[in-house]
């Protein structure tokens, strides 16, 4: 059994997340994850899911009753999702911590928008003509 | 020239994002994107970047002066990043809209944690024995 299982069970007790009513109104993450089989699509979704859990854990970081559980799960996420690569984790954290209401951040984001957009599709790495062909229907990942 | 370029230039004017001082203290996104060549790593980072821009655009959605520009750019993101796949975009939006302070959402998230964790690494799709081998150093994605 992976180490996170016991700690996740501890969190379930703490949050009363084992109660039958928790399953009402569908799932938050599981149904969405089932929709996406392509690795790159899964990463798009998992990126949001992981940032949600990190925010959740941050809100409860000073609660001694679950601190060990939270730390174990965070460590496990770092091994599994970030491949134990601290640079990857640090870059991810930077992105999640930018404040969308900070006017300096807004200006920088808009300043960088053209270059960000140019790199958004995997096609960005190949020639322009090839790219326009792809957008004419060459691509069929779903 | 891609349609977003003209509209992004319009946003730059609106936010005074063409001023020389905008480049002070490094980039928000561009240096991070340069660090990651693997497609799945890029998607992890781009997922956060796209959600940032969507939040930013939401904050300015009622401003008539940039409404057309914002709509054009969002449409272009949908084509490039979400492959014109509305289901992908909808799932992404759901994930970005969950409130981390809502106790029902917290309980659901904790309830689903074990299953989410089990799927976090690409190794999750293969047998348990193979996964433990991978963590013993079999993997070399970069």
């Amino acid at each position: 059994q992976d180490p996170y299982v016991k700690e996740a069970e501890n969190l379930k007790k703490y949050f009363n997340a084992g109660d039958p009513d928790v399953a009402d109104n569908g799932t938050l993450f599981l149904d969405i994850l089932r929709n996406w089989k392509e690795e790159s699509d899964r990463k798009i979704m998992q990126s949001q899911i992981v940032s949600f859990y990190f925010k959740l854990f941050k809100n409860f970081k000073d609660d001694q009753r679950i601190q060990k559980s939270v730390e174990t799960i965070k460590e496990d996420i770092n091994v599994k999702f970030f491949n134990s690569n601290k640079k990857k984790r640090d870059d991810f954290e930077k992105l999640t911590n930018y404040s969308v209401t900070d006017s300096n951040v807004q200006r920088k984001a808009v300043h960088e928008l053209i270059q960000v957009m140019a790199e958004l599709s995997p096609a960005a790495k190949i020639g322009k003509r090839k790219r326009s062909q792809m957008f004419r229907g060459r691509r069929a990942s779903q | 020239q891609d349609p977003y370029v003209k509209e992004a230039e319009n946003l730059k004017k609106y936010f005074n994002a063409g001023d020389p001082d905008v480049a002070d203290n490094g980039t928000l996104f561009l240096d991070i994107l340069r660090n990651w060549k693997e497609e799945s790593d890029r998607k992890i980072m781009q997922s956060q970047i796209v959600s940032f821009y969507f939040k930013l655009f939401k904050n300015f959605k009622d401003d008539q002066r940039i409404q057309k520009s914002v709509e054009t750019i969002k449409e272009d993101i949908n084509v490039k990043f979400f492959n014109s796949n509305k289901k992908k975009r909808d799932d992404f939006e759901k994930l970005t809209n969950y409130s981390v302070t809502d106790s029902n959402v917290q309980r659901k998230a904790v309830h689903e944690l074990i299953q989410v964790m089990a799927e976090l690494s690409p190794a999750a799709k293969i047998g348990k024995r193979k996964r433990s081998q991978m963590f013993r150093g079999r993997r070399a994605s970069q």
């Epitope: 992976d2 730390e71 134990s84 601290k86 | 660090n35 993997r139 970069q142």
Partner: antibody
Framework: EVQLVESGGGLVKPGDSLTVSCVAS????????IHWVRQAPGKGLEWVAT????????FYSDSLRGRFTVSRDNAANSVYLHMSSLRGEDTALYYC?????????????????WGRGTLVTVSS | NFMLTQPLSVSGYPGKTIVISCVRS????????VQWFQQRPGSAPAMVIY?????PSGIPDRFSGSVDASSNSASLTISGLKTEDEADYFC??????????FGGGTKLTVLG
């Protein structure tokens, strides 16, 4: 003050087994990954294995996997490296090194703190 | 196979600046942090640069680290060379999942 103290080295014959130990102090041991790094006489540094903190995942050098096993006892602030089927080329100074705390995004640097090493000599 | 390649030896006069390179053979150098270690004879390695360009406390600002994606390499620069800088220097990075990788080491000789 962070301290890592290795022990258990010595002279062994080819084919024998040996376990070297490392006792840590001065930090919350269970939070940190621990690496084993070795250095043959007059040679460079070679990473051997790593064990994660609370989750105890094991990572090995491709060239050593199968013969070496890393483990830890968080209650005893200790980490162990069990080496079997030892060969002459395993003769080296074995260092215990503190890694990252991967549960903390502000963790101190990886490989910042090293022990003084324990010498393993494999010879007939 | 992943390798970090360093020059076998580098030398310089006191007060001068030397640069030790560390070239990554495959994968992107920018995708993993790079550390640098100094090792004097009979001592354990001591970190002089961590996470590409940061100095641990107690390391003078004569030591600096950088990464250049275009050459897929990292560099350690030591300015105002001193005789006590004479030592072996190792770069270190990662590949895969927590696989630690060391360069072969560079012997720095301070001349004169």
């Amino acid at each position: 003050e962070v301290q890592l103290v290795e022990s258990g080295g010595g002279l062994v014959k080819p084919g024998d087994s040996l376990t070297v130990s490392c006792v840590a102090s001065g930090f919350t041991f269970s939070n940190y990954f621990i690496h084993w790094v070795r250095q043959a006489p007059g040679k460079g540094l070679e990473w051997v294995a790593t064990i994660s903190g609370r989750t105890k995942y094991m990572f090995y050098s491709d060239s050593l996997r199968g013969r070496f096993t890393v483990s830890r006892d968080n209650a005893a602030n200790s980490v162990y490296l069990h080496m079997s089927s030892l060969r002459g080329e395993d003769t080296a100074l074995y260092y215990c090194v503190r890694g990252y705390d991967h549960s903390d995004s502000n963790s101190a640097a990886d490989l910042l703190h090293w022990g003084r090493g324990t010498l393993v000599t494999v010879s007939s | 196979n992943f390798m970090l390649t360093q020059p076998l030896s580098v030398s310089g006069y006191p007060g001068k600046t030397i640069v030790i390179s560390c070239v990554r053979s495959s994968g992107s150098v920018a995708s993993h942090y790079v550390q640098w270690f100094q090792q004097r004879p009979g001592s354990a390695p001591a970190m002089v640069i961590y996470e590409d360009s940061h100095r641990p406390s107690g390391i003078p600002d004569r030591f600096s680290g950088s990464v250049d994606a275009s050459s897929n390499s990292a560099s350690l620069t030591i300015s105002g060379l001193k005789t006590e800088d004479e030592a072996d220097y190792f770069c270190q990075s990662y590949y895969g999942n927590n696989q630690v990788l060391f360069g072969g080491g560079t012997k720095l000789t301070v001349l004169g």
